[in-house]
Interface confidence: low
């Protein structure tokens, strides 16, 4: 038996979805003009970084692409990146791959993703269309950190 990643359509409260632009993720209005990505989510088997108060330890990838979300510091600031990596390769690693790990927490019916490498930094979308998905410490009106996951086949 082998686990399989779960697939989700992801959107924020402003009806922004994630769209692949080259090897970057950007936020765009949910419309006929855009093809949103489907998010792959799988739980990390290694419990080294577990913190149930913060949520479940997960890896995040883009379905149909060998691309996974990871966090690294660029010019002193935690930054969200896409790396060529198969999510199942991450899952099969015995040791947790920290830069690729996120705490997935439920807030009501919405989901929040916090970087494990950079506690207090959350995946976010801005209110402006076409901006990259990014990491923020400032949760609120300008930076949307709550996402709705719709399960897809």
């Amino acid at each position: 038996w082998q686990a399989a990643p779960k697939s989700y359509a992801i959107r924020d409260s402003r009806q922004m979805v994630w769209v692949l632009s080259g090897n970057s993720l950007i936020a765009a209005p949910l419309s006929n003009r855009v093809k949103p990505v489907t998010l792959h989510l799988i739980t990390c088997r290694d419990t080294e970084f577990s913190d149930k108060k913060k949520g479940n330890l997960v890896y995040l990838g883009i379905r149909g692409k060998d691309l996974c979300l990871f966090c690294e510091e660029i010019q002193g600031k935690p930054t969200l990146q896409l790396k060529e990596k198969n999510i199942m390769d991450l899952y099969m690693e015995k040791k947790a791959q920290k830069p690729f790990l996120f705490f997935h927490n439920k807030e009501g019916s919405s989901s929040v993703f916090q970087s494990v490498s950079y506690p207090g930094w959350f995946i976010a979308t801005s209110s402006t269309s076409g901006q990259p998905i990014f990491l923020t410490q400032e949760r609120g009106i300008t930076n949307n950190t709550n996402f709705y996951l719709d399960s897809v086949e």
Epitope: A9, S13, R14, Q15, M16, A28, P29, L30, S31, N32, R33, V34, K35, P36, G108, S109, S110, S127, S129, Y148, D150, S151
Partner: antibody, heavy 122, light 111 residues
Framework: QLQLQESGPGLVKPSETLSLTCTVS??????????WGWIRQPPGKGLEWIGS???????YYNPSLKSRVTISVDTSKNQFSLKLSSVTAADTAVYYC??????????????WGQGTLVTVSS | QSVLTQPPSVSGAPGQRVTISCTGS?????????VHWYQQLPGTAPKLLIY???NRPSGVPDRFSGSKSGTSASLAITGLQAEDEADYYC???????????FGGGTKLTVL
């Protein structure tokens, strides 16, 4: 064939809470491809979106009404409901419940109830 | 004042072509959000006429068509018939309001 039916009092006193229920028949309210909304139309005027709820229980409200509106779902009864508090005469309208379709994008409200007139008066 | 602007009324003779405009802004139609159109016959609930800017639900005659460009959208009705006399509403999503918005409605009169 999916049908929606609004029910609730036709007369509400000022400052009280308006409560309406929409019963869904011929389909399940828990389907992930749909969301459910309330829209109203004051006599002789245009349509105004009040709010929506989806199968996860996520709610979206018109900012101008947000402080007074609550939309909830009762999956066991295949119903969703609207509560609008502190009503005034300006809330007098025909209230419609509707189903919205979702598949990678929003596809509009494709099924509507026949509407119920709610009058706010003492 | 509606966020989406429609002409209050339009008219045409049977067989003619009429268009109804829906003008928004960079926070709704211009931001890329889809436009939907509804027909409301007198004394009845609205009916979805066009979804996703250009698509017709099954059962809607091909005399009805939708288009979108920039911050505006249009509904065109060709071969006008007496039964087309109704109110027509456009709808889109507005990111600054974080909600769905309707146009003020256009009354179509068939002369």
């Amino acid at each position: 064939q999916l049908q929606l039916q609004e029910s609730g009092p036709g007369l509400v006193k000022p400052s009280e809470t308006l409560s309406l229920t929409c019963t869904v028949s011929g389909g399940s309210i828990t389907s992930s491809n749909y969301y459910w909304g309330w829209i109203r139309q004051p006599p002789g005027k245009g349509l105004e979106w009040i709010g929506s709820i989806d199968y996860t229980g996520s709610t979206y409200y018109n900012p101008s009404l947000k402080s007074r509106v609550t939309i909830s779902v009762d999956t066991s009864k295949n119903q969703f409901s609207l509560k609008l508090s502190s009503v005034t005469a300006a809330d007098t309208a025909v209230y419609y419940c509707a189903r919205g379709k979702y598949y990678e994008t929003y596809l509009g409200f494709d099924v509507w109830g026949q509407g119920t007139l709610v009058t706010v008066s003492s | 004042q509606s966020v989406l602007t429609q002409p209050p009324s339009v008219s045409g003779a049977p067989g003619q072509r009429v268009t109804i405009s829906c003008t928004g802004s960079s926070s709704n139609i211009g931001a890329g959000y889809d436009v939907h159109w509804y027909q409301q016959l007198p004394g009845t609930a609205p009916k979805l006429l066009i979804y996703g800017n250009t698509n017709r639900p099954s059962g809607v005659p091909d005399r009805f068509s939708g288009s979108k460009s920039g911050t505006s959208a249009s509904l065109a009705i060709t071969g006008l018939q007496a039964e087309d006399e109704a109110d027509y509403y456009c709808q889109s999503y507005d990111i600054s309001l974080s909600g769905w918005v309707f146009g003020g409605g256009t009354k179509l009169t068939v002369l």
